[in-house]
């Protein structure tokens, strides 16, 4: 009996470690700067590193500039995004400035997109000013379901910071749906 | 065998308990404002609060104004940095402010730096009001070893709030590493 | 003894299943936009869904305004408030705002209320743009003992912006007590 | 964008007084700490006065507190340093500089972005 119950708590262990690993599916994704499209409008962002510097990914799929959820389950999403401008670059276009980051969840079976977060600031960037920077951070707790997708879009991408510190997005999973 | 199984199971629930909450490093460090250097230069915040009011850590170590890793992981990070300024307390040297975090890894085997977070705010504090304030908050889900050391830096010291649930940092231990 | 293992590693998925489900519960509150209160004062946020799009609550109750912690442990508590205005709304009282949110605990059984986290900026919202916009994160990592209750306290609460993507607040368990 | 440009600056005799006056153009300096500095040959640059953005704050160098008063006048975009009781080791050029953004003074060059070309300033014994 005592090596049946060796065994026993043997693939315990093995099945608590292994079913733990498994459950727990994350991302923290980078913004990849050789990407970043131009203009001031809200666009889709959708270049960013998965493996390279913080950026990691597991149990999850980047593919067509979206976060691939591909376990059903409860997770903790968050998003930081930096803008910055030096009189170096040029003048801007305009003083006054809609700063905006949205997150979105897109379900493939139905088709629609919905905005699950959205933080920023309208912004007055004065031309006294040699330097502007500006960060966003939003986070929130979503019930995800295999399949479903997460994107990022902001305005003004052009204003981006493009180090991975500044801008990045992710997701860990926190538990299981009931 | 019925007993064999109720000591499996007893050992099990034991070992599960104690395997969960040894896995859980967390830590929250508010600031301690007895300390908060002068200047408007970026620099490293050493003194915080680790176990009173809201300050708290488990199974990480708080020391040299820099909070340590024990036990490898991925854990989620944050910061919440507020800054303030009222017209009682003088006049500031200029009306442009860069109001900054950085939140660093550095790792004492490989002696080195990393920022793995940045959030902020240049700011215009116009001396035509009487009261300035601004929060910055940053988070992210970071792959941290045994012996790493995260701090954080921030512009302007002079203007941090000293209160408990305006200026502090964290972070917790979400899963092991494969 | 196979028979038995086999009722044994049944036994315990049952178990590790069930616990990992109660031992995590979860909340996460979007803005009752029909029943913002008025004013440009510090006010206490009643009106919150908790069961209708992105809204969700689970072995945490919602009551009288306030969440309320059903579950001893140690949660990671988070909120996201945006404020904006528009010129076809009318004008502003003043052009000098203080927006900020106050995360709040109350104790039931010793009467008394402290400030969690707070977060947020005073704004100049001049009269020559013709909408403004801002969004507070804040989060952070605290120990919450069932039948306290957590609540969000704003200024400025006519400017909140009444989406669900907007302003909402959270908490879900990371671990328990020692 | 800020174009700083020193004058006033001479030839003076032990005891004298000189006015430095800064002329800035590009943009309005009134948000802005101004500061002057100074370096002798061979002698990092130094610094000399700050004043912050709307003139109630001002700091010295300790060798020069008491004879020096620096001051500014935002309408006109324009700083000054009033140097009296001048001694042989004040000679140096003085330059004029923007400190565009801090809560708090800087007291070293790093600190300050723009700069102007410098005024020489030789006090004979």
């Known amino acids: 009996i005592r090596a049946e119950k060796a065994m026993v708590d043997g693939s315990w262990l093995d099945l608590a470690k292994r079913s733990k690993l498994e459950a727990q599916p994350f991302a923290h994704l980078t913004i990849n700067a050789t990407d970043i499209p131009s203009g001031s409008h809200k666009v889709s962002l959708s270049s960013w590193y998965h493996d390279r510097g913080w950026a990691k990914i597991s149990n999850m799929t980047f593919s067509n500039g979206k976060l691939i959820v591909n376990q059903d389950g409860f997770y903790y999403l968050y998003a930081n995004i930096c803008f910055r401008h030096h009189e170096t670059s040029g003048d801007l276009a305009t003083e006054y400035l809609q700063l905006m980051v949205y997150v979105t969840k897109t379900s493939i079976k139905i088709p629609s997109s919905h905005t699950l977060m959205k933080g920023g600031s309208t912004k007055y960037w004065s031309g006294n000013s040699e330097f502007h920077f500006y960060s966003i951070n939003v986070g929130g707790f979503f019930k995800l379901r295999s399949g479903e997708e997460i994107s990022i879009e902001v305005s003004n991408p052009s204003l981006l910071d493009p180090d991975q510190d500044a801008t990045y997005f992710g997701a860990f999973k926190v538990r299981d749906i009931d | 065998i019925r007993a064999e199984k109720a000591m499996v199971d007893g050992s099990w629930l034991d070992l599960a308990k104690r395997s969960k909450l040894e896995a859980q490093p967390f830590a929250h460090l508010t600031i301690n404002a007895t300390d908060i250097p002068s200047g408007s230069h970026k620099v490293s915040l050493s003194s915080w609060y680790h176990d009173r009011g809201w300050a708290k850590i488990s199974n990480m170590t708080f020391s040299n104004g820099k909070l340590i890793v024990n036990q490898d992981g991925f854990y989620y990070l944050y910061a919440n940095i507020c800054f303030r300024h009222h017209e009682t307390s003088g006049d500031l040297a200029t009306e442009y402010l860069q109001l900054m975090v950085y939140v660093t890894k550095t790792s004492i085997k490989i002696p080195s730096s990393h920022t793995l977070m940045k959030g902020g705010s240049t700011k215009y504090w116009s001396g035509n009001s009487e009261f300035h304030f601004y929060s910055i908050n940053v988070g992210g889900f970071f792959k941290l070893r045994s012996g790493e050391e995260i701090s954080i830096e921030v512009s302007n010291p002079s203007l941090l709030d000293p209160d408990q649930d305006a200026t502090y940092f964290g972070a917790f231990k979400v899963r092991d590493i494969d | 003894i196979r028979a038995e293992k086999a009722m044994v590693d049944g036994s315990w998925l049952d178990l590790a299943k069930r616990s990992k489900l109660e031992a995590q519960p979860f909340a996460h509150l979007t803005i009752n936009a029909t029943d913002i209160p008025s004013g440009s004062h510090k006010v206490s946020l009643s009106s919150w869904y908790h069961d209708r799009g992105w809204a969700k609550i689970s072995n945490m109750t919602f009551s009288n305004g306030k969440l309320i912690v059903n579950q001893d442990g140690f949660y990671y508590l988070y909120a996201n408030i945006c404020f904006r205005h528009h010129e076809t709304s009318g004008d502003l009282a003043t052009e000098y705002l203080q927006l900020m949110v106050y995360v709040t605990k109350t104790s039931i059984k010793i009467p008394s209320s402290h400030t969690l986290m707070k977060g947020g900026s005073t704004k100049y919202w001049s009269g020559n743009s013709e909408f403004h916009f801002y969004s507070i994160n804040v989060g952070g990592f605290f120990k919450l003992r069932s039948g306290e209750e957590i609540s969000i306290e704003v200024s400025n609460p006519s400017l909140l912006d009444p989406d669900q993507d907007a302003t909402y607040f959270g908490a879900f368990k990371v671990r328990d007590i020692d | 964008k800020v174009q700083l440009v020193e004058s006033g600056g001479g030839l003076v005799q032990t005891g004298d007084s000189l006015r430095l006056s800064c002329a800035a153009s590009?943009?309005?300096?009134?948000?802005?700490?101004m500061g002057w500095f100074r370096q002798a040959p061979g002698k990092e640059r130094e610094f000399v006065a700050v004043?912050?953005?709307?003139?109630?704050?001002?700091k010295y160098a300790d060798r020069v507190k008491g004879r020096f008063t620096i001051s500014r006048d935002n309408a006109k975009n324009m700083v000054y340093l009033q140097m009296n009781s001048l001694k042989p080791d004040d000679t140096a050029v003085y330059y004029c500089?923007?400190?565009?953004?801090?809560?708090?003074?800087?007291?070293?060059?790093?600190?300050?972005?723009?700069w102007g070309q410098g005024t020489q300033v030789t006090v004979s014994s």
């Open positions: 500089a923007a400190q565009t953004s801090g809560a708090d003074f800087g007291t070293t060059p790093q600190r300050y972005t723009y």
């Open positions: 590009g943009r309005a300096i009134g948000s802005y700490a």
């Open positions: 004043i912050n953005y709307r003139g109630s704050s001002l």
